[in-house]
Amino acid sequence: EPPTACREKQYLINSQCCSLCQPGQKLVSDCTEFTETECLPCSESEFLDTWNRETRCHQHKYCDPNLGLQVQQKGTSETDTICTCEEGLHCTSESCESCVPHRSCLPGFGVKQIATGVSDTICEPCPVGFFSNVSSAFEKCRPWTSCETKDLVVQQAGTNKTDVVCGPQDRQ
């Protein structure tokens, strides 16, 4: 009786279980009662990443420099090319099909995590005692100046956007 299901790494065709092609190879001929499945390796610019019965290999992803992309990892016959973004840019999605500039943290916010090729800048509000007076993709919140250590007194309180202003103590 012909099979209705096949083992792992096999497929059912013409009431027969045929071996799948190994990763990195495509199908050129199904098996028959007398012959095994015939496969052929993918060419240099192509890949197949699973045991398969595909008659065509997939093209490697193109990391388009016009979109700010560059190759992070070159594809093989079994793996796709992995793209990342040029410095100062990050991917717009997990599949990294295009890039956008890193976000800058506005005054009053500091950089919690610097952006990478695949993730944007993460900003955080400067807590009490810290400030940021610039729009930057790198600068963390900086602590207010400690007037006391300079033998000075606070003349103007700091905010999340400005440092304290120190001045000389009043001589009475």
């Epitope: 990763p23 990195g24 001929s29 199904d30 012959t35 015939e38 052929l40 240099e44 093989t76």
Partner: antibody, heavy 121, light 113 residues
Framework: QVQLKQSGPGLVQPSQSLSITCTVS????????LHWVRQSPGKGLEWLGV???????DYNAAFMSRLSITKDNSKSQVFFKMNSLQADDTAIYYC???????????????WGQGTSVTVSS | DIVMTQSPSSLAMSVGQKVTMSCKSS????????????LAWYQQRPGQSPKLLIY???TRESGVPDRFLGSGSGTDFTLTISSVQAEDLADYFC?????????FGSGTKLEIK
């Protein structure tokens, strides 16, 4: 024993087409694919295309627009046709049996006697 | 397309001598999943059709004498004839059978002194 016999013209006019038949014995075309290769002093051995045992074809992209490979399994014949021949298509044309060695490995283990083709008016 | 380059283009040897010829491919013929190198060698005696000697770099086709040895990996391959015989007078071609279009080297002509 395995044999591949080729038949076809020796002389082709420029811009005309070339047709060669490869008749095989000792094996079935439903079990083995068949390649076409040509050899010229200027370009050496050039793989032109293959018809796999299931009937699907792969062609060398350089010849795809003017090449056709078909077969008749019941007659054990493979038909090669190339259009628009020019002087630089002058060569010996071979059919060759495909052998599959597993792991995606293919080679040409038996060859026809070759058909010497001259393109000239 | 994968370009195959053979050297030398010709060589002359005496019977009993060891012969080596080289074949280089423009890209690796090593399949990373199964670690096989997809290179074949063919012999073409004068006036005859090519004959398959070796496939997968080093596997001799049945009936091929064991004096023919194939070796190499990646992009560099060698055919060695350990003790050349008069009947080895021929052209030798390497061919990548990694993927289509299958491509051949330009050949090495072996002459017997």
């Amino acid at each position: 024993q395995v044999q591949l016999k080729q038949s076809g013209p020796g002389l082709v006019q420029p811009s005309q087409s070339l047709s060669i038949t490869c008749t095989v014995s000792g094996f079935s075309l439903t079990t083995y694919g068949l390649h076409w290769v040509r050899q010229s002093p200027g370009k050496g051995l050039e793989w032109l295309g293959v018809i796999w045992r299931g009937g699907n074809t792969d062609y060398n992209a350089a010849f795809m627009s003017r090449l056709s490979i078909t077969k008749d399994n019941s007659k054990s014949q493979v038909f090669f046709k190339m259009n628009s021949l020019q002087a630089d298509d002058t060569a010996i044309y071979y059919c060759a049996k495909n052998s599959y060695y597993g792991n995606g490995g293919h080679a040409m283990d038996y060859w026809g006697q070759g058909t010497s083709v001259t393109v000239s008016s | 397309d994968i370009v195959m380059t053979q050297s030398p283009s010709s060589l002359a040897m005496s019977v009993g001598q060891k012969v080596t010829m080289s074949c280089k491919s423009s890209q690796s013929l090593l399949h990373s999943f199964n670690q096989k190198n997809y290179l074949a060698w063919y012999q073409q005696r004068p006036g005859q059709s090519p004959k398959l000697l070796i496939y997968f770099t080093s596997t001799r086709e049945s009936g091929v004498p064991d004096r023919f040895l194939g070796s190499g990996s990646g992009t560099d391959f060698t055919l060695t004839i350990s003790s050349v015989q008069a009947e080895d007078l021929a052209d030798y071609f390497c061919q990548q059978h990694y993927t289509t279009p299958f491509t051949f080297g330009s050949g090495t002509k072996l002459e017997i002194k």
